[in-house]
Interface confidence: low
């Protein structure tokens, strides 16, 4: 089998891959480079929240239905250190981070920065978990679309060293003057993979639960002092959450985090795993997920050992759904799929055969239909119920992967592509 199935980033460190990036990135910004606006009826606002200031606290980006639509768009990747982290994740020289920054440092995502929350309604809540090498801002297309349909979305930035980069403040004084301490991605030796990835997914689940607790406390009116100096009054969120309607969604490593979180925290009523990477999960988890769970997979990332683990979550008394998006790649769920033109996107496996807008639209609509069904929403998302069953020309019901050959090495398959 392929070495990449054991070592998540090994195949990206090959000189061929590095050369590909270095030669082609200069052209990356040509072609269609827009992160799509949400398709729903609500304007979308965005802010960041960190509490407490330490690396054990919660750090998240919040997308929410907004009162107005006249604010500046949100900076997509807000600090140079994130680009340095991405270059480390890609196995390239740190100078590559500066090139990435030149290309993408001023790119925005279509949400109104620090815009006031739209009042007068209680919104369902989604906690979102990013993948390996990503961070809180890289799934804005999903967060914005959900918020445009009336969800509050809390995109967590994990501090388990699986993010390309993240920051915190060493103490209160550091927080007051904005003196950030940065944590970069931890690269693992082959023999560390199983143990450390399981530790990380457990920490990630705790961070999702902690993010939920924090938001519910704010909803109850606890005065939260954001460690970040931002002009968004968290008190606006008081009485804004529909506390019975809470879900968790994540991509790749975040997909595994969804499953771990559901098994630990019954406050989450359902979960959606986007192209989940199942390797980090311990065997004890599969039978401990009573909530409805929806797997939305790409066509080209999945492999038998991973699908077998997904199937271990199934049992007759539990609600499980799975669809596969035809012609899609692992990165079709993350914003980088919109950051480059077609040719570059194909070469870097950021884009698949399917149009990126079509792929994310299918995923988002299927997600909304699933959320309506299992959170008991009174919306019109049931118009997309057929997508949950894979009933669309661009969808495959279930999976395209044949799992009948049982010689696959389940234990050692970690199988990852680029940003998980």
């Amino acid at each position: 089998f392929d070495w990449q199935y054991i070592n998540p980033v090994a195949h990206m460190k090959s000189s061929a891959w590095v050369n590909k990036i270095q030669v082609l990135m200069a052209a990356a910004s040509f072609g269609q480079t827009k992160i799509p606006r949400g398709n729903g009826p609500y304007s979308v606002g965005c802010t960041d929240l960190m509490f407490d200031h330490t690396n054990k606290g919660t750090f998240l980006r919040l997308y929410y239905p907004s009162q107005d639509n006249d604010r500046l768009d949100t900076l997509w990747i807000p600090n140079k250190e994130y680009f340095w982290g991405l270059s480390k994740f890609l196995g390239t020289h740190w100078l590559m981070g500066n090139i990435l920054r030149l290309l993408f440092g001023s790119m925005t995502t279509p949400a109104n920065w620090n815009s006031p929350l739209r009042p007068g309604e209680k919104y369902p809540l989604v906690v979102f978990s990013h993948g390996l090498g990503a961070f809180r801002t890289l799934y804005s297309a999903i967060g914005i679309d959900l918020a445009s349909h009336g969800f509050i979305v809390a995109a967590v930035e994990h501090r388990d060293r699986s993010a390309s980069a993240t920051y915190y403040f060493k103490d209160q004084s550091a927080a007051e003057i904005g003196d950030k301490s940065w944590l970069y991605l931890r690269t693992l030796k082959q023999e560390e993979e199983t143990h450390i990835r399981n530790e990380q997914v457990r920490q990630r689940a705790k961070e999702c639960s902690q993010a939920l607790s924090l938001i519910l406390d704010i909803d109850h009116g606890k005065p939260v002092k954001n460690a970040l100096d931002l002009k968004f009054d968290m008190e606006q969120l008081k009485d804004s959450i529909d506390r019975e309607k809470i879900a968790v969604i994540g991509h790749s490593f975040g997909g595994a985090t969804v499953i771990q979180t559901l098994s630990e925290d019954q406050r989450f009523r359902c979960g959606i795993a986007l192209d989940a990477w199942m390797f980090p999960l311990g065997d004890e988890v599969y039978s401990r997920i009573p909530q409805p769970l929806f797997f939305i997979n790409s066509e080209y990332f999945q492999y038998p050992a991973n699908i077998i683990k997904m199937k271990k979550c199934y049992s007759p008394d539990k609600e499980r759904k799975m669809i596969t998006i035809r012609g899609s790649v692992h990165q079709n769920f993350a914003d980088f799929t919109f950051a480059t033109g077609k040719i570059i996107g194909h070469m870097l496996k950021l884009k698949g055969d399917i149009d990126s807008n079509v792929a994310i639209d299918l995923s988002n609509k299927a997600s909304l239909a699933f959320l309506q069904k299992h959170l008991g929403l009174h919306k019109d998302f049931d118009q997309w119920d057929c997508l949950i069953e894979g009933d669309d020309e661009n969808l495959i019901p279930g999976t395209n992967i044949n799992t009948t050959n049982q010689h696959i090495m389940l234990q050692n398959s970690s199988g990852i592509e680029k940003y998980n």
Epitope: D52, T54, K56, S213, K222, P223, K225, N226, K231
Partner: antibody, heavy 116, light 112 residues
Framework: EVQLEQSGPGLVQPSQSLSITCTVS????????VLWVRQSPGKGLEWLGI???????DYNAAFISRLSITKDNSKSQVFFEMNSLQANDTAIYYC??????????WGQGTSVTVSS | DIVLTQSPLTLSVTIGQPASISCKSS???????????LNWLLQRPGQSPKRLIY???KLDSGVPDRFTGCGSGKDFTLKISRVEAEDLGVYYC?????????FGGGTKLEIK
């Protein structure tokens, strides 16, 4: 209902250590912070230290060398330990739940006398 | 550290009359997010302190509306519109804008 229950000795010998346990109910230590305050006889309130929800602790600079605050989230317990007590450490020691710079709830207090 | 100076030290009031306590800070308590983290506590005789007001003017649940808090920057005031017997005790202002948290020296409210 939120409650903080303190347990610890009333009498401590000079130069010995003081250990107080604050057991909380009605909230989670993974979300709330817990701080410690003391009140010397006839005096006001003095902030001693805090353990943040994330697990790190910060201390009043005057006590940093002899104070330790730790916790066990699973048991909902916070542990306060102060070394090398002297007569002027005689006070009522309080734990309080602390949430974003607002003192919400207080323990009943532990009256500590330092005397031989 | 921030020094909070309360005045008066003792306040002797007749039941039904108003009362006012001042708290002055050595530095502005306005945080960068536009809020001042200034709270008022009441410690009744023989009891633990109890928070009455947070964020300068917001009343804790169960606190009678005869209590009001106001002020900004460095100067803050707690007012009681009509003092009742249960209001006696020591009132403390406490700031959380700057680390470490600090308390005022306390104002003892006595009933005449």
């Amino acid at each position: 209902e939120v409650q903080l229950e303190q347990s610890g000795p009333g009498l401590v010998q000079p130069s010995q250590s003081l250990s107080i346990t604050c057991t909380v109910s009605g909230f989670s230590l993974t979300t709330y912070d817990v701080l410690w305050v003391r009140q010397s006889p006839g005096k006001g309130l003095e902030w001693l230290g805090i353990i943040w929800s994330g697990g790190s602790a910060d201390y009043n600079a005057a006590f940093i060398s002899r104070l330790s605050i730790t916790k066990d989230n699973s048991k909902s317990q916070v542990f306060f330990e102060m070394n090398s007590l002297q007569a002027n450490d005689t006070a009522i020691y309080y734990c309080a739940s602390y949430y974003i710079n607002a003192l919400d709830y207080w323990g009943q207090g532990t009256s500590v006398t330092v005397s031989s | 550290d921030i020094v909070l100076t309360q005045s008066p030290l003792t306040l002797s009031v007749t039941i039904g009359q108003p009362a006012s306590i001042s708290c002055k800070s050595s530095q502005s308590l306005l945080y960068s997010n536009g809020k001042s983290f200034l709270n008022w506590l009441l410690q009744r005789p023989g009891q633990s302190p109890k928070r009455l007001i947070y964020l300068v003017s917001k009343l804790d649940s169960g606190v009678p509306d005869r209590f009001t808090g106001c002020g900004s920057g460095k100067d803050f005031t707690l007012k009681i519109s009509r003092v009742e017997a249960e209001d006696l005790g020591v009132y403390y202002c406490v700031q959380g804008t700057h680390f470490p948290q600090t308390f005022g020296g306390g104002t003892k409210l006595e009933i005449k």
